[in-house]
Amino acid sequence: MNGSEYFVKIQSFLGGAPTEDLKALSQQNVSMDLATFMKLRTDAVLPLTVAEVQKLLGPHVEGLKAEERHRPVRDWILRQRQDDLDTLGLGLQGGIPNGYLVLDLSMQEALSGTPCLLGP
């Protein structure tokens, strides 16, 4: 069974998938469609890297631009380095500026909804 066939079989169960499962899926050439991606749990999507999202979505990554103001894409963008977002070639804006340090302060983030940044 190839990645696409596997994805069709598990698609209906993906809404509640944890980050670990999404990371594993990104290695299997599944080409998840945008509609499915938009239904994923925000907390599961946030830890994914740009490279992992690109692999997870395949050609569907082109659809991120039209969804950049909607969750979970909007919140995911805020967590990525702008340099990494630029590699997607879609003009996605709102990432962490180059030269900033991201502190993983879970309590701060839980309260504010955004990561804590230290300037250069």
Partner: antibody
Framework: EVQLVQSGAEVKKPGASVKVSCKAS????????MHWVRQAPGQGLEWMGN????????YYNERFRSRVTMTVDKSTSTVYMELSSLRSEDTAVYYC??????????????WGQGTTVTVSS | DIQMTQSPSSLSASVGDRVTITCKAS??????IAWYQHKPGKAPKLLIH???ELQPGVPSRFSGSGSGRDYTFTISSLQPEDIATYYC?????????FGGGTKVEIK
């Protein structure tokens, strides 16, 4: 003003390869993927694939996957489409097209002027 | 991939006539359809996107409608300059597909 300027007409022999260029200007080149569409005589428009201008990653129509190569030169804001093992059925006008990402995956709002490729022995 | 079945493949109508072209998608495309006018030796020209949104500068005689799998493109009053081939494009999927085209001629 957005402009997509393509290379000139080509005449090739069967079995040869052709490389068509598309130079973009008037917008941030790395903010939009570039697509290639062709039209053979008496046929409709056919989507061939696209390329991410930032990292050079392409996605191809399955029909052309074994014969097409799309590349990018960021320094000159130019994308290239190379088609190999040419046959007479590849005689067509080849267009580059830029999408507008207003909704979903984007429709094409800007097109190159087209490059005529003739395959003949 | 999503297939787009366009009909008719050609039509002949008189100036002033109402012309209708249809495109049927192989699956629901959520209104993500665009319509193009293509004249010989020219690049395709975008007329309509998202089923019914008219591009700036495009005459109001052109219109579009539909939902789900079925879509319609209409020229309310055919003009001599409308002689061209018209194509639908689905962009609900990143692997874009066009309809087969409709060649419009004047009687």
């Amino acid at each position: 003003e957005v402009q997509l300027v393509q290379s000139g007409a080509e005449v090739k022999k069967p079995g040869a390869s052709v490389k068509v260029s598309c130079k973009a200007s008037g917008y941030t080149f790395t903010n939009y993927w570039m697509h290639w569409v062709r039209q053979a005589p008496g046929q409709g428009l056919e989507w061939m694939g696209n390329i991410n201008p930032s990292n050079g990653g392409p996605y191809y129509n399955e029909r052309f996957r074994s014969r097409v190569t799309m590349t990018v030169d960021k320094s000159t804001s130019t994308v290239y489409m190379e088609l190999s093992s040419l046959r007479s059925e590849d005689t067509a006008v080849y267009y580059c097209a830029r999408p507008y990402y207003g909704s979903s995956y984007g429709y094409f709002d800007y097109w190159g002027q087209g490059t005529t490729v003739t395959v003949s022995s | 991939d999503i297939q787009m079945t366009q009909s008719p493949s050609s039509l002949s109508a008189s100036v002033g006539d109402r012309v209708t072209i249809t495109c049927k998608a192989s699956q629901d495309i959520n209104k993500y359809i665009a319509w193009y006018q293509h004249k010989p030796g020219k690049a395709p020209k975008l007329l309509i996107h998202y089923t019914s949104e008219l591009q700036p500068g495009v005459p109001s005689r052109f219109s579009g409608s539909g939902s789900g799998r079925d879509y319609t493109f209409t020229i309310s009053s055919l003009q001599p300059e409308d002689i061209a081939t018209y194509y639908c494009l689905q962009y609900a999927n990143p692997l874009r597909t066009f309809g087969g085209g409709t060649k419009v001629e004047i009687k």
